[in-house]
Amino acid sequence: SAPGEDEECGRVRDFVAKLANNTHQHVFDDLRGSVSLSWVGDSTGVILVLTTFHVPLVIMTFGQSKLYRSEDYGKNFKDITDLINNTFIRTEFGMAIGPENSGKVVLTAEVSGGSRGGRIFRSSDFAKNFVQTDLPFHPLTQMMYSPQNSDYLLALSTENGLWVSKNFGGKWEEIHKAVCLAKWGSDNTIFFTTYANGSCKADLGALELWRTSDLGKSFKTIGVKIYSFGLGGRFLFASVMADKDTTRRIHVSTDQGDTWSMAQLPSVGQEQFYSILAANDDMVFMHVDEPGDTGFGTIFTSDDRGIVYSKSLDRHLYTTTGGETDFTNVTSLRGVYITSVLSEDNSIQTMITFDQGGRWTHLRKPENSECDATAKNKNECSLHIHASYSISQKLNVPMAPLSEPNAVGIVIAHGSVGDAISVMVPDVYISDDGGYSWTKMLEGPHYYTILDSGGIIVAIEHSSRPINVIKFSTDEGQCWQTYTFTRDPIYFTGLASEPGARSMNISIWGFTESFLTSQWVSYTIDFKDILERNCEEKDYTIWLAHSTDPEDYEDGCILGYKEQFLRLRKSSVCQNGRDYVVTKQPSICLCSLEDFLCDFGYYRPENDSKCVEQPELKGHDLEFCLYGREEHLTTNGYRKIPGDKCQGGVNPVREVKDLKKKCTSNFLSPEKQNSKSN
């Protein structure tokens, strides 16, 4: 990482006494079963904990659950099981917490076999009180809140009915039958697929895609021959079966399904899949599976309409539909993504992009690390990051990579240093510049979390033995202090801190075991007295993101602009605080060819910034489908990268003409759509 401000580790003064005064133990009066924890609202301090325990009897399983509530970030808990009439709560539905700070919670109860419908418990006051409601259906899925209005809920029933409530679950109405999948879109719109003949599975590829914008009063069929659909950013995607064979193609809409365009992506066969890896309002990362059981595919990045795609990364590791991919959005720095590729020799290597998929490179070898046994050359190797795939393979990796938008530049991950990911026990590495440079932070696997917007990093060693020690760093992982939080070690099960990394509280969850019983226990540690003063201006330094060469005029330019951030100095031990807002200053860069992606019919040869015509399209008119009409494209091969803000400099010419012809290849052209009202 960037040269540290302090080579020597200064100890935080009197931290043991300060932390001891701020360590709160809570022993749960339960037998150990499963425990789930949810935060209710932002900065409210309200946590709900649901413990469940199954007792197998001779012919049935008897379940028991308890509900606890804290309103001080987990320091104290109150048993509120009586608020839900001591009912057994179904953990597979989890606790459905309302969006933003609505304070809404829905718990789905277990009901006896013969009942007419399910039962839910609803709270709209941050779980202070609950109302029991019997449902006219048995839910198949968790209640889904409309992102725009937390009073609007939707759920699918076990009979494939689509049910909607407009008054936060008080009253329910079945708005459609034979529904396979339903999702909220923007503006309280619901998208869903329906089957006509037998079932969702039988009709796969012959489903219809419907839309309602008025909670079921009226409907519009916006697609036919649908295999599946997905929403990402402002894009609606549908994979549609081809007329002639069993292949399917992606179609995309940016107007809620009124008009569709065929995405310039390869079609896929029965055994293959598409996957939206990431999407925002500018663009989408799409994975297209390779034919055969290869375990890899290709990442494509879209233009601003989601139609023209550029090949971004070959041999991208993605095991099966709904399987594992290591694709990770590094949220602490704009434009950065990390993923894994499966190389020809079947080893797995980590790749990183700093420009939203434009270029991928290996991760730079940490300065304080040696190349491991996987390296052919002991002086030349890279850092390889363990993510979802390693976790799924049961490697000794307790956590995926971690980054937080308000902890600018910080990325923490397990990794190994060599030519490929190693199955050996990994260490924990940190980057303070969004992935450009890395340092070994902790030896061996750990759980880790970020507090106070990066002001504190907390870690606990991953061990099969009981633990009683927590580690913390106030200088972005350079130096570590250890604190013994209990005399009696516990079997550790998880670290919990409020989402958003603004809190200064961390909860350590685990269980204690004695001769006959085991009990859940939590220790909540408040670090407020370690960071005893509020940060002042002198505690911050300015940092230019994406800086690789200070002498280069375009240093820091990514997607057409550079950003300078105020960041906490590593040597400052102070509180950013809950109200901390990232201070950044953008400045526009001149356009270069790097700010353009290759247009339809063009590609970039390796290590070249120029776009050249695809040989098979040379001399042909460039015609493609847009909104069900054929368009003629006049281009010199470039299209501005979505989200790129550059101005001046290079400016390639581009013109699109409407050929006033219908596309025969577009199955979702507007005249195939119809509307109806309830």
């Epitope: 040269p3 080579e7 300015i542 230019l544 800086s547 240093d555 550079k562 300078q564 400045s587």
Partner: antibody
Framework: QVQLVQSGAEVKKPGSSVKVSCKAS????????ISWVRQAPGQGLEWMGG????????NYAQKFQGRVTITADESTSTAYMELSSLRSEDTAVYYC?????????????????WGQGTTVTVSS | DIQMTQSPSTLSASVGDRVTITCRAS??????LAWYQQKPGKAPKLLIY???SLESGVPSRFSGSGSGTEFTLTISSLQPDDFATYYC????????FGGGTKVEIK
């Protein structure tokens, strides 16, 4: 190689203001910090304040707070230092200097490029 | 603001001598210290940054050491071109300079 070229010598009356410019040529401007340092005749160096042009926010020494304004114009790669309410003890050579940078951080790596200096004389 | 005290204020030495200049900070500044050389009528020239890192192009006879509050600049073998005034400067927060040390011919 970067060069910092400062405006010419100034003679000012007490109570008036002076504005000294510092133009960068031959390298980047917006992503380096620029400091202003003065040196009275026969005296040592005194830091007045600094700015990172791309960031826009200036930082001033306590002694000059309220009397000095440091600005930067990225389009012309020029930094400015304006000192108001001049008095005779402000007679000095005023230097602009670029703060070195090895990484994205503006950690302190010393002032590696200096202007030639601008003599400001305050006399009635 | 942090005060920087440089000693001695004047130092007489001969060519070939080993010269040491000391700088003391009123509070810890970690390693945020730079050393400059200035000749009459000229702008200062950076010699050392971050207490001990030699700026490129500066002869290796110059070296810096120290951290916290005590720092030294050493010229291992004084050359005719080295007769000048030397300043230390801290940058932990706001920048302040030491009073200077004039190295003159004995």
């Amino acid at each position: 190689q970067v060069q910092l070229v400062q405006s010419g010598a100034e003679v000012k009356k007490p109570g008036s203001s002076v504005k000294v410019s510092c133009k960068a040529s031959g390298g980047t401007f917006s992503s380096y910090a620029i400091s202003w340092v003065r040196q009275a005749p026969g005296q040592g160096l005194e830091w007045m304040g600094g700015i990172i042009p791309g960031f826009g926010r200036a930082n001033y020494a306590q002694k000059f707070q309220g009397r000095v304004t440091i600005t930067a114009d990225e389009s012309t790669s020029t930094a400015y230092m304006e000192l108001s309410s001049l008095r005779s003890e402000d007679t000095a050579v005023y230097y602009c200097a670029r703060q070195g940078r090895k990484t994205g951080y503006y950690y302190y790596y010393g002032m590696d490029v200096w202007g030639q200096g601008t003599t400001v004389t305050v006399s009635s | 603001d942090i005060q920087m005290t440089q000693s001695p204020s004047t130092l007489s030495a001969s060519v070939g001598d080993r010269v040491t200049i000391t700088c003391r900070a009123s509070q810890s500044i970690s390693s945020w210290l730079a050393w400059y050389q200035q000749k009459p009528g000229k702008a200062p020239k950076l010699l050392i940054y971050k207490a001990s890192s030699l700026e490129s192009g500066v002869p290796s006879r110059f070296s810096g050491s120290g951290s916290g509050t005590e720092f030294t600049l050493t010229i291992s073998s004084l050359q005719p071109d080295d007769f000048a005034t030397y300043y230390c400067q801290q940058a932990d927060g706001h920048i302040t300079f030491g009073g200077g040390t004039k190295v003159e011919i004995k």
